[in-house]
Every structure is written in structure tokens, then in C-alpha cells.
Interface confidence: low
């Protein structure tokens, strides 16, 4: 049997909406022939399924085999090192992978200007892997919220923050002109999920966008 192979030091999930990636750290002093075996356990079906016999990477996309994550009690994953006929003990994820572990994102943010207001529309994520009925708004059907960060350019990079409860929002510019840049971070008030800030979207506001009223 030779020397024992050490186990991967840690195994964890990093997930966004229908983008579920398992990561692990490599064993020390691995050889060119070292690879990793990945197995998955679904809560309620107490048996491990082998997913990959020999992955020579440090991550594995488990989205396709965890599509029911949002309707299940969750999963655990485990990884072990394999080198020829030798293999290590398994390292198991130390938390249950459930909907609570999914980092919330938005698809995009669209901005337009109307009468001195910036009108924003948050597009929700539409991942290709998601089953047709599993939309973001059907899974997170209540208490969706969005933190809005607004930056004025030119300016001293100070942010204004605002929380909204809808995918449509409006920002009053107080008659200021210039470039306004907006980022959005989603959350669900009834849940503990982390949110990820969106890409910054910018729009220029000039005098022509203001209507003169008496």
C-alpha cells in the first residue's frame, strides 16, 4: 500500500444562482499523477454518489447534479486524493450546502433618465442551467430587496446608499448634472444569503434632461 496520501485540507462550495461550484485545496507535495475523486450526498438519500473519479483540477461544477437544490434539504460533498492505487481519506464539506449558501446576484442593471430622475430596472439572473420553472422570482418569491449604491462623477467618490424593495427604482438627482454610477446588491429580507455587488452601470445627466416648469 505504501505511504498514506494526505487528504485535501479543505473542501467548500461557492455558489451563485444555478452555478454551484465545489472547490478544494490541493494536498501538499502532490505528484503529476495526483487527481481528485468527488462524491455527492443528497440529504434524505443517505448514500454517496461518485461524480468524478479523477479530476485534475481544484474545482468541479456540480450545477447539473444539484439542480433540485432549491427544492431539497441540501447536499454534502466530499473529495479525496488519488494517486495510482493509493488514495487518501475523504474530506467532507463542513457545512450543509443548501439554498442558504447561494450568493445572490442580479443579471444586470439598466438605467435611463426621465425628467431629472434616474430610473433603474434590475434584471434578475437567468442562468441557462436553470429549469424553466425555477426562476429567481419564483424561488425567492417574497421579501426581495436591493441595496443601491450611487456614485457621482466627478466627485470625491462618496457613495449614497438606498434600499429598495422592487426591481424598479428611481433616484432623484436634485438637479445635479454629470455622470452617475450605480451598483446593486440583492438580498432577501427573510433569508441570510450573502449578496454580490453588481457591475457598476453609469449614465450621464445633462441639462437637456430637465423639464422647465413654472
Amino acid at each position: 500500500h505504501g505511504t498514506e496520501l494526505p487528504s485535501p485540507p479543505s473542501v467548500w462550495f461557492e455558489a451563485e444562482f444555478f452555478h454551484h461550484i465545489l472547490h478544494w485545496t490541493p494536498i501538499p507535495n502532490q505528484s503529476e499523477s495526483t487527481c481528485y475523486e468527488v462524491a455527492l450526498l443528497r440529504y434524505g438519500i443517505e448514500s454517496w454518489n461518485s461524480i468524478s473519479n479523477c479530476s485534475q483540477t481544484l474545482s468541479y461544477d456540480l450545477t447539473a447534479v444539484t439542480l433540485d437544490l432549491y427544492h431539497s434539504n441540501g447536499y454534502r460533498a466530499r473529495v479525496r486524493a488519488v494517486d495510482g492505487s493509493r488514495h487518501s481519506n475523504w474530506t467532507v464539506t463542513n457545512t450543509r450546502f443548501s439554498v442558504d449558501e447561494v450568493t445572490l446576484t442580479v443579471g444586470s442593471v439598466n438605467l435611463e433618465i426621465h425628467n431629472g430622475f434616474i430610473l433603474g430596472k434590475i434584471q434578475l439572473p437567468r442562468p441557462k442551467m436553470a429549469p424553466a420553472n425555477d426562476t429567481y422570482e419564483s424561488i425567492f418569491s417574497h421579501f426581495r430587496e436591493y441595496e443601491i449604491a450611487i456614485r457621482k462623477v466627478p466627485g470625491n467618490f462618496t457613495f449614497t446608499h438606498k434600499k429598495v424593495k422592487h426591481e424598479n427604482f428611481s433616484l432623484l438627482t436634485s438637479g445635479e448634472v454629470g455622470e452617475f454610477c450605480v451598483q446593486v446588491k440583492p438580498s432577501v429580507a427573510s433569508r441570510s444569503n450573502k449578496g454580490m455587488w453588481s457591475k457598476e452601470e453609469c449614465i450621464s445627466l445633462t441639462r437637456q434632461y430637465f423639464t422647465v416648469t413654472n
Partner: nanobody
Framework: QVQLQESGGGSIQAGGSLRLSCVAS????????MAWFRQSPGKEREAVAA????????LYSDSNKGRFTISQDNAKMTVYLQMNSLKSEDTAMYYC??????????????????WGQGTQVTVSS
């Protein structure tokens, strides 16, 4: 053991093309996203393009969409950046990055854990 090595930079006339390569060590390739960033003197490092190596899905920063193409060769564990119609403002040091940190914005330099040493691209008009 974990490393990224860029190559393919050089000096070129405006309007020309270059192809940059980033070779990853075996245990870094296919880990989540790999990306190209660039940095010109006195400016912040900015994203150019990224690829999700498990599926080949690509993303581009708006400023370079159309002129730059990111691609991969799984057998060679290499990510490429094809740059066409180069302009003088493309002059910069180009860096390859890998392993995006969780919960981070993909096109932020702080989001990536591993970086190459960079390859210089100089475009003269």
C-alpha cells in the same frame, strides 16, 4: 507549484494584432474563472476579458468588446487573448489571473487570488 506564465507581448504598430498566452499549472487550470487584466502606468489594473474554463463561457469588458477575443486550449492548459485593431491606448502590461474569490465582482482585480508576472504590450502610432 501553482503558477501562471504569460507570453506573446511585444511592440507593434497601431492597427496590428497580437495573441497573448497564459499557461497555467495543472492544478490551477479549470479552477472557476481565468481572466486577463491590464495596467498602464499611473492607472489601476483593469479587466479585459474572462473565461469560465469548465464551459468556455466568455465575458468581456465593454471597452474592448469586438476587438479582443478570449479563448482556451484545455489540452495545453492555456488561455489566450487575441487582440486585433490595436490602438496606442492598448499599451499596458497584461496580466493573467485565476481563481475568483467567492461573492466578488468578476471584473475587479481584488477578486482574483493568483496572478502571473505580466507581459508588456506597446502599440505605437
Amino acid at each position: 507549484q501553482v503558477q501562471l506564465q504569460e507570453s506573446g507581448g511585444g511592440s507593434i504598430q497601431a492597427g496590428g494584432s497580437l495573441r497573448l498566452s497564459c499557461v497555467a499549472s495543472k492544478y490551477l487550470y479549470s479552477t472557476n474563472y481565468m481572466a486577463w487584466f491590464r495596467q498602464s502606468p499611473g492607472k489601476e489594473r483593469e479587466a479585459v476579458a474572462a473565461i469560465y474554463t469548465a464551459s468556455g463561457a466568455t465575458l468581456y469588458s465593454d471597452s474592448n468588446k469586438g476587438r479582443f477575443t478570449i479563448s482556451q486550449d484545455n489540452a495545453k492548459m492555456t488561455v489566450y487573448l487575441q487582440m486585433n485593431s490595436l490602438k496606442s491606448e492598448d499599451t499596458a502590461m497584461y496580466y493573467c489571473a485565476a481563481v475568483r474569490k467567492t461573492g466578488s465582482y468578476l471584473f475587479d482585480a481584488q477578486s482574483f487570488t493568483y496572478w502571473g508576472q505580466g507581459t508588456q504590450v506597446t502599440v505605437s502610432s
